[in-house]
Amino acid sequence: YPYDVPDYAGGGGSGGGGSMMTGTIETTGNISAEKGGSIILQCHLSSTTAQVAQVNWEQQDQLLAICNADLGWHISPSFKDRVAPGPGLGLTLQSLTVNDTGEYFCIYHTYPDGTYTGRIFLEVLESSVAEHGARFQIP
């Protein structure tokens, strides 16, 4: 959706929410992908009847994309060439580089619960390493 704003930073974070928070966010967890390839970041909010007004996707403290219930998708200008909306409320990262390694957050803005935050750790591997089956893992 063609929002009329420049690129800007969002604020990451983990947790928070209303006193009656019952929901949980399931994510793809710790994942790895090959340099130059693509990866889908997925979160799913369950176990709550809260209304989802907006989902923000953030990397560290940078806003990547927004999916708004009224307006649909907006991709931040500095990421528009490498980020695609979907599938669903997920986000597809393309043309991956080693610099894309790091934490990603899906932030669900809901009513009346408040904010739910899911975390995904992505490691982008050099092609030769990926071909040999190496995978990033956090114990």
Epitope: G11, G13, D70
Partner: antibody
Framework: EVQLVESGGGLVQPGGSLRLSCAAS????????MHWVRQAPGKGLEWVAF????????YYADTVKGRFTISRDNAKNSLYLQMNSLRAEDTAVYYC????????????WGQGTMVTVSS | DIQMTQSPSSLSASVGDRVTITCRAS??????LAWYQQKPGKAPKLLIY???TLQSGVPSRFSGSGSGTDFTLTISSLQPEDFATYYC?????????FGGGTKVEIK
Amino acid sequence: EVQLVESGGGLVQPGGSLRLSCAASGFTFSNFGMHWVRQAPGKGLEWVAFISSGSSSIYYADTVKGRFTISRDNAKNSLYLQMNSLRAEDTAVYYCARMRLDYYAMDYWGQGTMVTVSS
Amino acid sequence: DIQMTQSPSSLSASVGDRVTITCRASKSISKYLAWYQQKPGKAPKLLIYSGSTLQSGVPSRFSGSGSGTDFTLTISSLQPEDFATYYCQQHNEYPWTFGGGTKVEIK
């Protein structure tokens, strides 16, 4: 330049009604959620109501729920607050404010309109 | 509802002073806290959101820190135009709630 201009305030008797308006300019109004926030004389700020860009999400403070109605007309770049069954404790300056696109705070505010509820 | 408690309620300071205002939430709000400045007869102005992110156009002498329940607004070198009332506000859940305000006066 983003501008928000409130109007419609005034003196009203307890139990009466008033409709506040907020005229928006300088941005694409239909892309942004909007709030009403009030401030009683000499007091702090109190959030009143929120409406999302396309009106699918509407939230109220418990103190006004059932008495106040927030609405918007994107074609007219206008936000409204219909206030019924007014009480003395509703006396305040009422501000309209724009929600940041990322839903993280209110980034632009109008100058406010004064509502006085008194007999 | 989440209660937001600001301290001090007022303070006196001189131009050039470093000023610190604190805000405490009655329960964790992660990083979702905003700070506003309000001058008499004027509308509030957003300074900081998400705990530490400076709103565009706000001078870098303003900074925010904290997460969970305890937050701080710091003005590194107070300027004449900074004498005002400052409010914190949690934007983690509805109803959004504000602190009672801190009035920064000239010493």
